[in-house]
């Protein structure tokens, strides 16, 4: 096998299907974030989730490392007709890609969106949401995926999660 | 041009137009994988397609060097819509990625999904699904695609399409 | 901090909420793509958008160096749904990236559509489209992005974005 | 508070009919779909039919198209289910239940097919 | 059409003990299940939704989970008012399909 160089920076991780816990409260540090902070991501599931030269921290990835990352994100929105009264047919899903760095506020990356189907004849709705993209972060950055409409996140290690690597 | 180390370990295989021969039978060797495997990808479309220090089989990409692999595929749904007798036949479009290792049964990595609209003003409907994350993989894996209501894929070459490549 | 080896060949470049002059005119040199070409990336917002190695011209990334790039993008549609009489309120959202060589004429690498709500009760539509994959690309390639429905496009420096970056 | 409330039930000869009503409350009926389920005595649940909240789509199975008919007025919050040509093997108690997930269910009514 | 093949069909247990009920879909459901319990005489009640959801009211020794196309009830201590017939429900496409129903008696 050829030398390959430095060892990786890189992370994979994933959801945990347990649902409490998974979302920061809205009062939490991170407030002038859109959305909710999903919180417990899981990184050491043999073959599905890691950490190499990454932290993991109350949900964030912490940067060891100078350069440029990809960072990317899929959450995977599930719902269903409830009947639930004073509820909008209407759901926005939104997910954000933010970044921590010595700026008291979180900056905004990236945000991908879609809305629900109008329909009054819809039973259900299935969504994922995928985002990636390349950016310049620093040592001890700490980056975080928020979500609107939290509840309907399926947590499946499949299915939502949260990744990086540095790119060179 | 400055030297740029080892060669790379690559690949992006995309869709071929004719339908026939693209999945396999449900009764072939992923009959526990969820949905039909897409077979019949292109690795040597000029410009388009390629592989370099990967193996295309049977549908599935084989890797030979071990080490993290950013992994990620498209796939687009195309279809008119067919009101039958005040039927509505919805769809859940869903993409998954599988590996298999020395395990017998195939390891999903990553699900995407999508269902269609279900409003009676329905005429068609056009579903990109992409996903990709990174992975561990190791000399001999192989990782495949498949997806649920296979007969609405669009195998255009730019449409639907599957890669990966080494990371570090 | 170990060494990194060569410098990097990366961009991430991105919308400029000014909708003006974002795209071309339809008559353009790129009137053999579908779509209308996104002319107006911002490259130097800091911690936002970046050019390393690599150029930007007329909304246009030129290749510096040859070799496989991981090329994608990120569009974000959004509207209010207007009542017509007896009009159609679908419509298509599709994402082309395409590469311009010595060949005259651009040559499509990636397409990723969505179709929009069909129903009567629909108010307003969020629709992000995203796609990426991997291709070769020589010296002085041009790779681009066009849209269909160009004037949806949100173009939040978050929300639609273009990048690659060199992978090995 | 959510209610379903089944009538309509009773004997009927092979080869007749009968409609079942579900009056519905607690809830905005309109924006709902609806179903019918029943269960044979000592059988498991089985799903008879489906009308979605805007009352654009009906569902059957296979084994009942042509012979039930699901149906809705919105104004009167109510649901329907009309069934022709009954069998012995239709006897059942009769369940509506709401939405399509089926959260909410009546106490059902009691269908008896025989001569 | 989707198939639900629950297990077991019958049930001895005492109370406090732990109980699991399964429900295998023949296909990819999307998580669209819900479990249900019939008393005789009772309205029927559904427990939990979308695989692991607790409906409201619902106690939380039940719980749901979902491991591909195998869903769990789990009950965590058997309590009298628990015995009752269980039933999960797919309802990611029709036709609707019921599993066969497990009766939980007491031992």
């Known amino acids: 096998v050829r030398e390959r160089g430095p060892q990786r920076v890189a992370a994979h991780i994933t959801g945990t299907r347990g649902r409490s816990n998974t979302l920061s409260s809205p009062n939490s540090k991170n407030e002038k974030a859109l959305g909710r902070k999903i919180n417990s991501w899981e990184s050491s599931r043999s073959g599905h989730s890691f950490l190499s030269n990454l932290h993991l921290r109350n949900g964030e990835l912490v940067i060891q490392e100078k350069g440029f990352y990809y960072i990317y994100s899929q959450t995977y929105f599930r719902f269903q007709e409830e009947i639930k009264e004073n509820t909008k047919n209407d759901k926005q899903m939104v997910q954000y890609i933010y970044k921590y760095t010595s700026y008291p506020d979180p900056i905004l990356l990236m945000k991908s969106a879609r809305n629900s189907c109008w329909s009054k004849d819809a039973e259900y709705g299935l969504y994922s949401i995928y985002q990636g993209g390349l950016f310049e972060l620093k040592k001890d950055d700490r980056i975080f995926v928020s979500v609107t409409n939290e509840h309907l996140i399926d947590m499946d290690h499949e299915a939502s999660f949260f990744g990086a690597f540095l790119v060179g | 041009v400055r030297e740029r180390g080892p060669q790379r370990v690559a690949a992006h295989i995309t869709g071929t137009r004719g339908r026939s021969n693209t999945l396999s039978s449900p009764n072939s060797k992923n009959e526990k994988a969820l949905g039909r495997k897409i077979n019949s990808w292109e690795s040597s479309r000029s410009g388009h397609s390629f592989l370099s220090n990967l193996h295309l089989r049977n549908g599935e990409l084989v890797i030979q060097e071990k080490g993290f692999y950013y992994i990620y595929s498209q796939t687009y749904f195309r279809f008119q819509e067919e009101i039958k007798e005040n039927t509505k036949n919805d769809k859940q479009m869903v993409q998954y990625i599988y590996k298999y290792t020395s395990y017998p049964d195939p390891i999903l990595l990553m699900k995407s999904a999508r269902n269609s609209c279900w409003s009676k003003d329905a005429e068609y409907g056009l579903y990109s699904i992409y996903q990709g994350g990174l992975f561990e993989l190791k000399k001999d894996d192989r990782i495949f695609v498949s997806v649920t209501n296979e007969h609405l894929i669009d195998m255009d070459h730019e449409a639907s399409f599957f890669g990966a490549f080494l990371v570090g | 901090v170990r060494e990194r080896g060569p410098q990097r060949v990366a961009a991430h470049i991105t919308g400029t909420r000014g909708r003006s002059n974002t795209l071309s005119s339809p008559n353009s040199k790129n009137e053999k793509a579908l779509g209308r070409k996104i002319n107006s990336w911002e490259s130097s917002r800091s911690g936002h958008s970046f050019l390393s190695n690599l150029h930007l011209r007329n909304g246009e990334l030129v290749i510096q160096e040859k070799g496989f790039y991981y090329i994608y993008s990120q569009t974000y549609f959004r509207f209010q749904e207007e009542i017509k009489e007896n009009t159609k309120n679908d419509k298509q959202m599709v994402q082309y990236i395409y590469k311009y060589t010595s060949y005259p004429d651009p040559i499509l690498l990636m397409k990723s559509a969505r179709n929009s709500c069909w129903s009567k009760d629909a108010e307003y539509g969020l629709y992000s489209i995203y796609q990426g994959g991997l291709f070769e690309l020589k010296k002085d390639d041009r790779i681009f992005v066009s849209v269909t429905n160009e004037h949806l496009i949100d173009m939040d420096h978050e929300a639609s974005f273009f990048g690659a970056f060199l992978v090995g | 508070e959510v209610q379903l409330v089944e009538s309509g039930g009773g004997l009927v000869q092979p080869g007749g009919s009968l409609r079942l009503s579900c009056a519905a409350s607690?809830?905005?009926?309109?924006?709902?779909?609806m179903s019918w389920v029943r269960q044979a005595p000592g059988k498991r649940l089985e799903w008879v039919a489906t009308?979605?909240?805007?009352?654009?789509?009906?569902y059957y199975p296979d084994n009942l198209k042509g012979r039930f008919t699901i149906s809705r007025d919105n104004a009167k919050n109510s649901l329907y289910l009309q069934m022709n040509s009954l069998r012995a093997e239709d006897t059942a108690v009769y369940y509506c239940?709401?939405?399509?997930?089926?959260?909410?269910w009546g106490q059902g009514t009691l269908v008896t097919v025989s001569s | 059409d989707i198939q639900l093949t629950q297990s077991p069909s019958f049930l001895s247990a005492s109370v406090g003990d732990r109980v699991t009920i399964t429900c295998r879909a023949s296909?990819?459901?999307?998580?669209?299940l819900s479990w249900l319990q019939q008393k005789p005489g009772k309205t029927i009640k559904r427990l939990i939704y979308?695989?692991?959801t607790l409906d409201s009211g619902v106690p939380s020794r039940f719980s749901g989970s979902r491991s591909g196309t195998e869903y769990t009830l789990t009950i965590s201590s058997l309590q009298p008012e628990d015995f009752a017939t269980y039933y999960c429900?797919?309802?990611?496409?029709?036709?609707?399909?019921f599993g066969g129903g497990t009766k939980v008696e007491i031992k």
């Open positions: 239940a709401a939405p399509t997930a089926m959260d909410y």
């Open positions: 607690g809830f905005t009926f309109s924006n709902y779909g």
């Open positions: 009308i979605s909240g805007g009352g654009s789509y009906t």
């Open positions: 296909q990819e459901i999307s998580g669209f």
């Open positions: 979308a695989a692991s």
């Open positions: 429900l797919q309802y990611a496409s029709y036709p609707r399909t």
